[in-house]
Interface confidence: medium
């Protein structure tokens, strides 16, 4: 249990201490206090480095002192012969004696008291980022105007987060721009546009001045853009090092500006605007896009018309065109639809003739009808050659879709008549 | 056929055999047979055969039998109470529409019809082929196909021949421009049982083809001159009749 003061005496004090003892005392004062330990009497066998008998003062892992010999006060007004001041609230005192004593030594008498420590000055690491205020038993941190104390109760920062930008165009700057930005701050800005618009950020090189990177290339102060799973940055240095136009391909962008305790510069200023999400012109062979544009964006509608001889097969119905809309995700609707070659199907058979099995029945394929020669011939002309036309019919140059007609060859005997001489 | 030679059906693949009455006809396309009106006037449902050289019953069983759907006799053919006494054979032409189309091949294929141009006007001396299973010098009916090559003759040559078994006065027999006279050479002629068969002449515009210039009709006496229906004069009637009585598929 912590106490505010106490006394420590060597064994048998003020009589001679026994041989071969080791005794330790754990001193603890309340949190927020240091310990003032002082000896009023010291009579311990002297040896080099106090190797034989000694009293040891330990603070954590550090030996604050090791005492032996005989001491008397330097100050006639004070009984103190040795003292220690530690800024911690715990201390250990260990007394050791060896197996023999040449003479009779009386040991030591020591007292400790809890003393206030000045956390603001007594430590190498300053506990507060801005103002440190000491009081008996502790300290507190405080901040300059317009700064607030973070949850760690030590660091001050500016309140620069929480802004959500929804307008299709806007400007965002670091706090105090173009005056130096606050140290030790994390500023988060959110841009949230309507779906179908991508955030495009534009910066001018001269509108960016952020503490430069360290020798390892790590930004000490940094500006980062996060769009979904894509990150742009971190950026730092004099003059913007990134692309002057950042197309995020997203309608949501988080801007994170992180600063450390030192090296404030003028900061940055950027503009953003919402671009309708572009849709790439996709591979759609054998078709024409109407209207034809160099770039298509969100809500654009195109009519994709198949070339003659191609059709869009949706279910069982064949159409020659379809509509596609550039969607908010940058993808086209109906993107699975394709212009496929018209299939004229298996050609009809004809009487007294035949058609060779076509290699293919798709658009452009050619078939040939023939009549059963020499007994039939093609009466209605056209040569018997048909091609699979754009309308899905087998078509002949002369007859159109009409099939050839094989009619009997007349007047031709297979063998000529020869009169027998009688 | 009098004075003719043995023939093979492949020489005359258009030749059609009628078994009642015993006669001939000419196939002109898949659905139509051309014959003489006097062949079908007494039997409007004739049985016909194609593709066989021999008309022996056993051979006919293996040949292609044709079933008639309808018989069209030329409207100018005069129907008589007693056909045996006929002296007027003008317009002796008829068409038989078949129920099913005939499949053509080496032994069955049609004969062409004459064109309407003057190229198809016959001159005396033009040669034509006749064929049939009619009376020969030796027998009343031939079992195997016979044929002969005859020249066209002036109509007066037919008029000059005395009718063998007249059923009326010689002057009663009618001769018209619708008739072709042919024969008179080496006794080659058509005869009873050859009626309706084609008088086939080489096409003047395509020497590989024959057309039906005439149809065996009648004659004063077998082995002299014979009379044949002049088909060229009936081409319009033939075409019109076939068109009006065809299925849409044939059109």
């Amino acid at each position: 249990e912590p106490t505010m003061y106490g006394e420590i005496l060597s064994p048998n004090y003020p009589q001679a201490y026994p041989s071969e003892v080791e005794k330790s005392w754990d001193i603890e004062v309340p949190e927020g206090y240091g310990i003032h330990l002082y000896f009023t009497h010291l009579d311990i066998e002297l040896s080099e480095n106090c190797a034989y008998d000694s009293v040891q003062i330990i603070s954590g892992d550090t030996e604050e002192g090791r005492l032996c010999g005989q001491r008397s006060s330097n100050n006639p007004h004070s009984p103190i012969v040795e003292e220690f001041q530690v800024p911690y609230n715990k201390l250990q005192v260990i007394f050791k004696s060896d197996f023999s004593n040449e003479e009779r030594f009386t040991g030591f008498a020591a007292y400790y008291v809890a003393t206030d420590i000045n956390e603001c000055t007594d430590f190498v690491d300053v506990p507060c980022s801005h103002f440190c205020n000491n009081f008996i038993g502790g300290y507190f941190c405080s901040c300059p105007p317009e700064y607030f104390l973070h949850d760690d109760m030590k660091n001050c920062g500016v309140n620069c987060s929480g802004d959500v930008f929804t307008a299709l165009i806007g400007e965002i700057a670091s706090p105090n721009y173009p005056k130096p930005y606050p140290e030790n701050s994390r500023c988060e800005y959110q841009i949230r546009l309507e779906k179908g618009f991508q955030v495009v950020v534009t910066l001018r090189r001269e509108d960016f001045d952020v503490e430069a990177a360290d020798s390892a290339g790590n930004c000490l102060d940094s500006l980062v853009f996060v769009a979904g799973d894509r990150q742009f940055g971190p950026y730092c240095g004099h003059g913007f090092p990134g692309p002057l136009n950042i197309e995020t391909k997203s309608n949501a962008l988080d801007i994170i500006f992180q600063t450390d305790l030192t090296g404030q510069k003028k900061g940055w200023k950027l503009r953003y605007h919402g671009d309708p999400m572009p849709c790439p012109k996709e591979d759609t062979p054998n078709s024409v896009w109407e209207p034809a544009k160099a770039k298509y964006v969100f809500r654009d509608v195109v009519q994709i018309t198949c070339l003659d001889g191609f059709e869009v097969v949706e279910g069982r119905v064949g159409a020659t065109s379809f509509y596609s809309t550039c969607q908010s995700n940058g993808k086209w609707s109906n993107s699975k639809l394709k212009c496929q070659p018209v299939d004229c199907g298996i050609p009809e058979s004809i009487e007294n003739g035949k058609v060779e099995d076509p290699e293919s029945t798709l658009f452009g394929s050619v078939i040939r009808y023939t009549c059963e020669e020499p007994y039939y011939y093609m009466e209605n002309g056209g040569g018997g050659e048909y091609h699979c036309a754009g309308n899905g019919s087998w078509v002949n140059e002369v007859l159109g879709p009409e099939l050839p007609k094989c009619v009997p060859v007349c007047g031709v005997p297979r063998e000529p008549f020869e009169e027998k001489q009688r | 056929i009098i004075g003719g030679s043995d023939a093979d059906i492949k020489n005359f693949p258009w030749q059609v055999f009628f078994d009642n009455p015993w006669a001939g006809g000419a196939l002109i396309n898949e659905y139509w047979v051309l014959t003489a009106a006097h062949v079908v006037e007494g039997n409007r449902e004739p049985t016909m055969y194609v593709g066989s050289t021999s008309v022996q019953t056993s051979r006919l069983a293996k040949s292609k039998m044709l079933t008639p759907e309808h018989v069209f006799i030329h409207p100018g053919w005069k129907l008589l109470e007693v056909p045996e006494g006929r002296t007027n054979f003008d317009n002796d032409i008829a068409l038989v529409r078949l129920k099913d189309p005939v499949k053509m091949g080496p032994t069955v294929s049609p004969i062409c019809l004459p064109g309407t141009s003057s190229d198809y006007n016959l001159m005396d001396g033009d040669l034509g082929l006749i064929s049939g299973w009619g009376r020969t010098e030796k027998r009343d009916r031939a079992v195997r196909l016979k044929a002969a090559r005859l020249p066209v003759a002036p109509l007066r040559k037919c008029k000059e021949v005395k009718v063998e078994k007249p059923t009326a006065d010689a002057e009663a027999y009618v001769f018209t421009p619708n008739m072709i006279c042919a024969g008179g050479e080496k006794g080659m002629d058509s005869c009873k049982g050859d009626s309706g068969g084609a008088f086939a002449v080489q096409d003047p515009n395509d020497k590989t083809k024959f057309y039906a210039a005439g149809l065996v009709s009648w004659g004063p006496q077998c082995g002299t001159y014979g009379l044949y229906t002049r088909v060229k004069n009936y081409v319009d009637w033939i075409m019109k009749t076939m068109q009006e009585n065809s299925t849409p598929r044939e059109d």
Partner: antibody
């Protein structure tokens, strides 16, 4: 960038076989019909075979029908030409080509040389 | 099959002159399926004009194409040194076979 790279050419005896491959990249291979075109030394272009985008339809030049087979593996973005019973007259530089609008051959490989000689 | 005949077989002209290359089909071809290619020695052919009149990517505007039915033309308004090459016409309207013309060699006079 669209790229077509042919391989598999070489010297073969008459009657022998070869299999040409065409590796495609830079585009959606399964969207396109593909062709093989050949060019005999010092001669013009001669179409050999075509295959539809899905691979179900094939077309051949009469003189190679029954000897050559065009095929494709859309999972590997590769076009093939299996050539059997090769003849001296099949000696040529063989190109693979992508068919685009109107079946124009908008991208060609660099070609692979097939030499048929005893 | 559709036979494509190109004329002339060789055309000798000087830079700056106008060049007209002809391609005649043995039967009618849809204009959507008639194309032209340029080939230089030792190189693969390049699509030059597609669907009769559309210039392929990167083709200079001095080139143009026209025609319908059986008669098609490739025209170069003012020849530049890099235009000298062999040009082939090609049809994919009636197939098989898909056919090419025999080529027109455009050479410097």
């Amino acid at each position: 960038e669209v790229m077509l790279v042919e391989s598999g050419g070489g010297l073969v005896k008459p009657g022998g076989s070869l299999r040409l491959s065409c590796a495609a990249s830079g585009f959606t291979f399964s969207n396109y019909a593909m062709s093989w075109v050949r060019q005999a030394p010092g001669k013009g272009l001669e179409w050999v075979a075509t295959i539809s985008s899905g691979g179900s339809h094939t077309y051949y030049l009469d003189s190679v029908k029954g000897r050559f087979t065009i095929s494709r593996d859309n999972s590997k973005d590769t076009l093939y030409l299996q050539m059997n019973s090769l003849r001296a007259e099949d000696t040529a530089l063989y190109y693979c080509a992508r068919l685009f609008t109107g079946y124009a051959m908008d991208y060609w490989g660099q070609g692979t040389l097939v030499t048929v000689s005893s | 099959q559709i036979v494509l005949t190109q004329s002339p077989a060789t055309l000798s002209l000087s830079p700056g002159e106008r060049a007209t290359l002809s391609c005649t089909a043995s039967s009618s071809v849809s204009s959507s399926y008639l194309h032209w290619y340029q080939q230089k020695p030792g190189k693969a052919p390049k699509l030059w004009i597609y669907s009769t009149s559309n210039l392929a990517s990167g083709v200079p505007s001095r080139f143009s194409g026209s025609g319908s039915g059986t008669d098609y033309t490739l025209t170069i308004s003012s020849l530049q040194p890099e235009d000298f090459a062999t040009y082939y016409c090609h049809q994919y309207y009636r197939h098989p076979p898909i056919t090419f013309g025999q080529g027109t060699k455009l050479e410097i006079k």
